[in-house]
């Protein structure tokens, strides 16, 4: 019995086709992905093939102005557009908080949305119950398949879960639903969740009774042959692990933004067993047209967003110092803005004994691409931060060692003068260089500041330990030749998108004055 | 649970026709083939033909001209008929799911007068 | 028609011996293959599937290997239970089987 399995993970906002690198649409013969254009392929293999499951592996929430304005309604609905068969939770869909997930998402999707990982308690327990589910058997064709899924356990630390849910370890919890299921005579079981590939993995290889497992999160690109496009493979699809009681398991995720569906092919035997597993990711490039309904039905949502763009968010009282000749040279209030917004976004306070769980952030001073002027009545607009963060990236929360801020820090002036992008701008750290001397060697003082504390206060960067930071994706990724940051980070969680980030502290703080203040000397 | 049971005579004359029913349970016909394979006692296994989940079947070239199965979906049976026995037809039958994952018993058939 | 090749027809060994057994396909089968165990009176039992993959509740001392046309068996500490008819099963095609290899009691 052969089963169709085409799944899509991190779209995070993606509606609308997007360029090659998942940014605003530009030239629209050379754009790909958007819902229109996935409806018409999902549609295309559910008439040619027989037993086809579309399924998401969470975080469609956040990540571009659709989100901001709809704030998940419009998942809910162009999910149900194209008839998906199931979700897992990811991280990003408690970003406004359970309420944010509960009225717009849960009460309105048309198909199950799971994780077996998350328990409700106290008085959410009973407003929550039923909405998610931790697993669902769905019949396809004559048969049934049981999805399981799971979320990613360091949710708390990068989202707005509140209080009433606990997150717990994926494994553990999986394994009683999964043996449940084979209770119930379900023998083919999908694990579909939101942890990143090296928990993927973990649960093929631990959890009993799991044939497949659909993930997410980490924007991991398998593919099998040739790649398509510029993601570089980081395994063949299926990536297969062996069990541990000796079953080949395939694992599979398509990188994200929509712009790829995955596409694998399952052959069970009569006892639920995986007798062969092949497929890859089909890239949604322009060679397969928009469906012309869900086209249609995004041009009417779109409207709302134009109007949105250009509505005041707050307003500012002094000069937004954007520009190239300050940002890349020396310490400016745009970038401590930005910063600021950063760690704002990133307030969690899980731990007593911390004051919150990051207080670091870094920011490209060439990723700082407009100033935003106080003398039109302070009016700071969408459409204003969009001039200045225009390249639709992510402030992501990432774990390093001191040893690497210092490398990046050593970075950031080692050809000062030039006008360069890797002038770092800061939160949370003081840093002061001596430029008289060779690069590589100009990093005097770097302090920062701390987190288990009452009081937060700056102390010496320590090279062995490990420092939570905030920083934008382009850097995560190693971006302007911040290389040390991409081979030497020990954790990497995506965010939430830089506009939003801003607009939203902007809309908190109502007017804002930011100064530059001796961050860096 | 899944399990394949095989009934039918025990013992048929030559030039008779067998006939075999295979009883499935704990998986569908229209999801799964099931196949059909026997051994003449000391002997090794021979495979004699397939029934798929659509309801088309393919036999062993050495069969073709005698051998029928045919299934009804709805009862969880698979018919093997065999006609013109021969004392060298005396073997266990074998019924088994399409990917071998699961066998009945078997039934040993002798062929005499 | 594939035609598998398997041997040894028999072997002798003792209780905590390792054995190997092998199947030779006459073309690349491409992992479409079976293991399956036989003993006198009792059902047929597949021990592994697709060339490597262990059914459910069979020990961790089989093990199966191989690609194209190579495949082999293995039981890294033989036990008493293990005495038995081993035969490879092809279903790349209409089904065929390895002539069998009987592990006996040295």
């Known amino acids: 019995w052969e089963l169709t399995i085409l799944h899509t993970n991190d779209v995070h906002s993606r509606l609308e086709q997007t360029s090659e690198d998942s940014s605003k649409c530009v030239n629209a013969s050379r754009c790909m992905g958007g819902v229109a254009r996935l409806f018409t392929k999902v549609q295309q293999i559910r008439r040619a093939e027989p037993n086809v499951l579309l399924l998401d592996a969470g975080d469609q929430y956040q990540g571009t102005i659709w989100f901001t304005v709809y704030k998940g309604a419009e998942v809910a609905h162009f999910m149900n557009a194209l008839r998906y068969d199931a979700m897992a939770l990811g991280n990003h869909e408690f970003d406004n908080g359970v309420e944010g997930l509960i009225e717009p998402l849960l009460k309105e999707a048309k198909f199950p949305i799971l994780s077996a990982n998350i328990k409700a308690k106290g008085p959410l327990a009973s407003q929550i119950s039923g909405l998610y589910l931790p697993y669902k058997v769905l019949p396809v064709g004559d048969e049934v398949v049981g999805i399981v899924g799971y979320t990613s356990k360091e949710t708390p630390f990068l989202s707005n879960p509140g209080t009433n849910l606990v997150f717990e370890d994926e494994i553990t919890a999986l394994q009683p639903e999964v043996d449940k299921l084979k209770t119930l005579n379900v023998n083919k079981i999908i694990a579909l969740g939101h942890s990143g590939f090296e928990m993927d993995k973990l649960i093929a290889q631990k959890v009993r009774g799991v044939d497949v497992v659909v993930g997410g999160h980490s924007n991991t690109f398998l593919y099998t042959g040739n790649p398509p496009s510029k993601e570089v493979p980081a395994g063949k699809y299926p990536f297969i692990v062996t069990s541990d009681d000796g079953r080949k398991v395939p694992v599979v995720q398509a990188y994200a933004f929509g712009k790829y569906l995955g596409y694998l092919k399952i052959e069970f035997d009569e006892r639920g067993n995986v007798i062969s597993s092949h497929g890859n990711p089909i890239l949604l490039n322009s060679s397969i047209p928009e469906d012309p309904s869900i086209k249609a039905d995004i041009n009417k949502w779109r409207i709302k967003l134009d109007n949105y763009s250009t509505q005041e968010l707050g307003k500012t009282i002094v000069y937004l110092d954007g520009s190239s000749q300050s940002c890349r040279f020396r310490e400016c209030n745009m970038g401590n803005l930005i910063c600021d917004a950063m760690i704002n976004n990133n307030l969690r306070h899980t731990d007593e004994m911390f004051w919150n769980h990051v207080s670091m952030c870094i920011l490209n001073g060439g990723g700082i691409r407009s100033p935003i002027d106080e003398r039109n009545n302070g009016t700071i607009t969408w459409e204003n931060l969009a001039a200045v963060l225009p390249f639709g990236g992510t402030f992501d929360l990432v774990q390093l060692k001191g040893s690497t801020l210092k490398k990046a820090f050593e970075h950031s002036v080692h050809r000062y003068g030039q006008s360069t992008g890797e002038f770092l701008q800061v939160g949370g750290i003081h840093v002061v260089y001596d430029l008289s001397r060779k690069p590589g060697d100009r990093v005097v003082k770097l302090d920062v500041l701390c987190t288990k504390c009452r009081v937060p206060s700056y102390d010496p960067l320590k090279m062995d330990e490990v420092y939570k930071v905030i920083l934008p994706n382009f850097l995560a990724n190693g971006g302007d030749g911040f290389q040390m940051i991409k081979d030497e980070l020990l954790r990497h969680d995506s965010g939430d998108q830089d506009i939003n980030v801003v607009s939203t502290y902007i809309s908190k703080m109502k007017v804002i004055y930011p100064a530059v203040e001796g961050r860096i000397k | 649970e899944v399990t394949l049971k095989e009934s039918g005579p025990v013992l048929v004359k030559p030039t008779e026709t067998l006939t075999l029913t295979c009883t499935v349970s704990?998986?569908?016909?229209?999801?799964?083939?099931i196949q059909w394979v026997r051994q003449p006692p000391g002997k090794l296994l021979e495979w004699l033909g397939v029934i798929w989940s659509g309801g088309s079947a393919d036999y062993n070239a050495a069969f073709i001209s005698r051998l029928t199965i045919s299934k009804d979906t709805s009862k969880s049976q698979v018919v093997l008929t065999m006609t013109n026995m021969d004392p060298v037809d005396t073997a266990t039958y074998y019924c088994a799911g399409q990917y071998g994952s699961v066998w009945g018993q078997g039934t040993l058939v002798t062929v005499s007068s | 028609d594939i035609q598998m090749t398997q041997s040894p027809s028999s072997l002798s060994a003792s209780v905590g011996d390792r054995v190997t057994i092998t199947c030779r396909a006459s073309?690349?089968?491409?992992?479409?293959l079976n293991w399956l165990q036989q003993k006198p009176g009792k059902a047929i039992k597949r021990l592994i599937y697709a060339t490597s993959s262990l059914d459910s509740g069979v020990p961790s001392r089989f093990s199966g290997s191989g690609s194209g046309t190579e495949y082999t068996l293995t039981i890294s500490s033989l036990q008493p239970e293990d005495f038995a008819t081993y035969y490879c099963l092809q279903y790349a095609g209409s089904w065929t089987f390895g002539g069998g290899t009987k592990v006996e009691i040295k």
């Open positions: 073309q690349d089968i491409g992992d479409r």
């Open positions: 704990g998986f569908s016909l229209s999801s799964y083939g």
